[in-house]
Amino acid sequence: KLLQVSTIAMQQQEKLIQQERALLNFTEWKRSCALQMKYCQAFMQNSLSSAHNSSPCPNNWIQNRESCYYVSEIWSIWHTSQENCLKEGSTLLQIESKEEMDFITGSLRKIKGSYDYWVGLSQDGHSGRWLWQDGSSPSPGLLPAERSQSANQVCGYVKSNSLLSSNCSTWKYFICEKYALRSSV
């Protein structure tokens, strides 16, 4: 009888673990959908604001070609950094080329010096592939140096003139990016 009760208890515990796992997966999926939704809204908001703003970039943002960049003065973990950018109608920095990387690192040298700045790069937990926030892969020359030994989720950041990786749950400055507004004149 005792063995029977023990077996039932173990089965119940196993069921509970499976339900917890399912709930965790659902929560992650929901968060991912919410972020994608915000991502689209950010670009919509950015496009619409062109009707009310003649300057290509907002105050305190730096312009380079078609992009505007904001270098934060606050520390956040990676996910919060992304949310902070979304609030500004932007996303975490997505580095498309060596030229853009050089511009960013050159600007950082002038502004702040050698600090850590989150960018919109994270490592897929299953495949281990590096992905930008829009789902694209970085070009081979823009892959983070494997510095993080973290068992947790790993995200990319810029320091000096390097792209590095770290546990996403550490606090760093961050860089936001959005399209510069085209002059209507």
Epitope: I74, W75, S76, I77, H79, T80, S81, N84, K87, S169
Partner: nanobody, 126 residues
Framework: QVQLQESGGGSVQAGGSLRLSCAAS????????MAWFRQAPGMERELVAA????????YYADSVKGRFTISRDNAENTVYLQMNSLKPEDTAVYYC???????????????????QGQGTQVTVSS
């Protein structure tokens, strides 16, 4: 913009105590959470302790629980970190931090964003 000025750092023997202070200016101090971070050479920044705007809610890293106490004086616009039973592994630069506007998640200090001071060095020798 928030200005934060830390003081009270220094060198101390293992087992000793230090009290860090942080004077804040530039906005209404009593409306925001405050925190202490630390960073040792070659290590990631670590949230050591945090306190809600009212002082009613606090957070401590496991490594300092029972040894460190965070407190605040809203009348004086100051936050404190009392550090007792110091260990060599507590050696780091300690940064005072003020919650950024609009980042409030009640009770969850981890996901908030923070302005920070210049830092004060704490060295614990064995």
């Amino acid at each position: 913009q928030v200005q934060l000025q830390e003081s009270g750092g220094g060198s101390v023997q293992a087992g000793g105590s230090l009290r860090l202070s942080c004077a804040a200016s530039g906005r209404t101090f009593s409306s925001y959470a405050m925190a202490w971070f630390r960073q040792a050479p070659g290590m990631e920044r670590e949230l050591v302790a945090a306190i809600s705007w009212s002082g009613g809610s606090t957070y401590y890293a496991d490594s300092v629980k029972g040894r460190f106490t965070i407190s605040r004086d809203n009348a004086e616009n100051t936050v404190y970190l009392q550090m007792n039973s110091l260990k060599p592994e507590d050696t780091a630069v300690y940064y005072c931090a003020a919650e950024a506007e609009g980042s409030g998640r009640e009770g969850n200090f981890y996901e908030r964003s923070w302005y920070q001071g210049q830092g004060t060095q704490v060295t614990v020798s064995s």
